[in-house]
């Protein structure tokens, strides 16, 4: 069965500076050549997008300028990265991959990917 | 409910002209390609063409045996994509179907006949 | 262009398993999709990319792909299932999709 399924990690932490890193992966039947990869970020049973991308297979993928996300693309594979995350952003992030071309369209979604983010604590003052 | 509604079609002389609609609503019509596929009687399915959506400049490819006479083109603002026809032929009649290949047209019968 | 060979017609009883086949040159490396098309209705997709179905479609359709033979099952088979049945690929040669001839299911 080449039916697309779409996997990403279960759990990552992000690093003290607010920056998460996952894989998302995408078992996709014959060759899609236009992918749309969006990030969904889902807590209290509400849904929101936190960036999207479409890239033609063999381009890099590219967010908007102002994007908290940036990724690379290798073959069936997206590497996301999200910026700029504290403490309140903690949540499941699902990785949503659309094959816009050839048709027909096909939507696969991963199950998500929860991210925990804890605030650095503040640097005391150093008395030298 | 995802919907393409078709408009247009009918009898027609040959060597006359005609143009079909496809109206998409409910769907991400820009995001998509869209093709005209046809169903002569007794026969099966035949592709005709398509026009890519804006990502691909909205480019057009045909069938062979339709280049030349047939234009394809769409209007993402209308949500709405047309299928001009013309020098028409006897063999031409057929049900005309607009698609993305996961929704379809309802379709609509040309007659090409003197 | 690919070339899609399938079996002009199909027939089966009531109740039973209908199973049509799509030939293709290693059809397997390809992404098949399977229409059912009705007298005066629409075509409407049943499987695509191999063996997934899209929303509304009964667990009773299935497809399958390996090697050069694709193939669209259909159990517990109903009056209802009478139709053509077209399987479809995309050339990436051409960019272009191609059609089998189709096959007619007929219900006994």
């Known amino acids: 069965c080449k039916a697309m399924h779409v996997a990403q990690p279960a759990v990552v932490l992000a690093s003290s500076r607010g920056i998460a890193s996952f894989v998302c992966e995408y078992a996709s039947p014959g060759k899609a050549t236009e992918v749309r990869v969006t990030v969904l970020r889902q807590a209290d049973s509400q849904v929101t997008e936190v960036c999207a991308a479409t890239y033609m297979m063999g381009n890099e993928l590219t967010f908007l300028d102002d994007s908290i996300c940036t990724g690379t693309s290798s073959g069936n594979q997206v590497n996301l990265t999200i910026q700029g995350l504290r403490a309140m952003d903690t949540g499941l992030y699902i990785c949503k991959v659309e094959l816009m071309y050839p048709p027909p369209y096909y939507l696969g979604i991963g199950n998500g990917t929860q991210i925990y983010v804890i605030d650095p604590e503040p640097c005391p003052d150093s008395d030298f | 409910e995802v919907q393409l509604v078709q408009s247009g079609g009918g009898l027609v002389q040959p060597g006359r002209s005609l143009r079909l609609s496809c109206r998409g609503s409910?769907?991400?019509?820009?995001?998509?390609?869209i093709s005209w596929v046809r169903q002569a009687p007794g026969k099966g399915l035949e592709w005709l063409g398509f026009?890519?959506?804006?990502?691909?400049?909205?480019?057009?490819d045909y069938v062979a045996s339709v280049k030349g006479r047939f234009t394809i083109s769409r209007d993402d603002s209308k949500f709405i994509a047309w299928l001009q026809m013309d020098s028409l032929k006897t063999d031409d009649t057929a049900v005309y179907y607009c698609?993305?290949?996961?929704?379809w047209g309802q379709g609509t019968l040309v007659t090409v006949s003197s | 262009l690919p070339v899609l060979t399938q079996p002009p017609s199909v027939s089966v009883a009531p109740g039973k398993t209908a199973r049509i086949s799509c030939g293709g040159n290693?059809?397997?490396?390809?992404?098949v999709h399977w229409y059912q098309k009705k007298p005066g209705q629409a075509p409407v997709l049943v499987i695509y990319?191999?063996?997934d179905r899209p929303s509304g479609i009964p667990e009773r359709f299935s497809g399958s792909n390996s090697g050069n033979t694709a193939t669209l099952r259909i159990s517990r088979v109903d009056a209802g299932d009478e139709a053509d049945y077209y399987c479809?690929?995309?050339?990436?040669?051409?960019?272009?999709?191609?059609f089998g001839g189709g096959t007619k299911l007929t219900v006994l």
């Open positions: 990319y191999d063996s």
């Open positions: 698609t993305t290949f996961n929704y």
């Open positions: 409910n769907f991400n019509f820009d995001d998509l390609a």
């Open positions: 026009v890519r959506s804006k990502a691909y400049g909205e480019t057009t």
């Open positions: 479809q690929v995309w050339d990436r040669t051409t960019d272009q999709p191609v």
């Open positions: 290693n059809i397997a490396s390809e992404a």
